[in-house]
Amino acid sequence: APLKIQAYFNETADLPCQFANSQNQSLSELVVFWQDQENLVLNEVYLGKEKFDSVHSKYMGRTSFDSDSWTLRLHNLQIKDKGLYQCIIHHKKPTGMIRIHQMNSELSVLANFSQPEIVPISNITENVYINLTCSSIHGYPEPKKMSVLLRTKNSTIEYDGVMQKSQDNVTELYDVSISLSVSFPDVTSNMTIFCILETDKTRLLSSPFSIELEDPQPPPDHIP
């Protein structure tokens, strides 16, 4: 099974070769290269020297080889970099090349969503409900769910919304939002609304959005 590696968008991933080198072979006798699942070459160290003519343009200038740990560092990670990678080592002999080591890694690329933000899209209407939108941007992978938590003096209730999502064509990052008309379940002077974004690993909470209800209006026919 491939070694599972997680790294963050725009940061660096370490793709290890985990070569024990029990025979103490010098890099000058070896050909070491990394390729992706489409057999595109990320980096090649040919007899101790980095060679660039076989490196695919999408990886050019984005890798660095650490000869001490036999690890390739892939920089400026993009979502599209996720997938399987192979480190392959050949021993170069006069008779030809012999594959002596292969290591498979599976890279996942993550991006943290921004803190969810609540935006009221109407005033408190007739003292009983509010229309609001909650949004969070620039994350990956897409979240599991988004919801609104309404807290009054005596109760806490969670409204699940239908999550709208859009994905950037270039970065592949997601922006997500929900829009809800939230009714106030009881007559209380103070309410606090939170927005919650749940991913596989985290639960992000918005800043609290506080509401103070005005006093009830008298009926229209009331004469003071």
């Epitope: 209407t125 007739e126 003292n127 009983v128 409900y129 409204y159 699940d160 919304g161 809800l180 008309s181 939230v182 009714s183 106030f184 379940p185 009881d186 007559v187 209800l213 009830p216 209006q217 009926p219």
Partner: nanobody, 118 residues
Amino acid sequence: EVQLVESGGGLVQAGGSLRLSCTGSQISFSDNTMNWYRQVPGKQRELVASLSIFGATGYADSVKGRFTISRDIAGNTVYLQMNDLKIEDTAVYYCKLGPVRRSRLEYWGQGTQVTVSS
């Protein structure tokens, strides 16, 4: 005069299901918030489910994934479908309409007893 009448309570074994109904007269359920509360003797009433004016549904953590609130606008009825009932769900369940727009008046039913046995 506005009246709310609950029904559907009873005795059920843990893991079982019940469906509570709340039917109203003299007021429309379609443009008002509908809520289900429950109360255990000696404790405060606890909001368990809420159906927003525009149909958004909200649940307390303790019932999320087990209870479902819904309404039949034509029949002016709101339902609480309760599945996988637990001993701690034993309580008197109340239906509440409101707060009503502008006036913020609230209308309560008389309650229906739900008892979950082991």
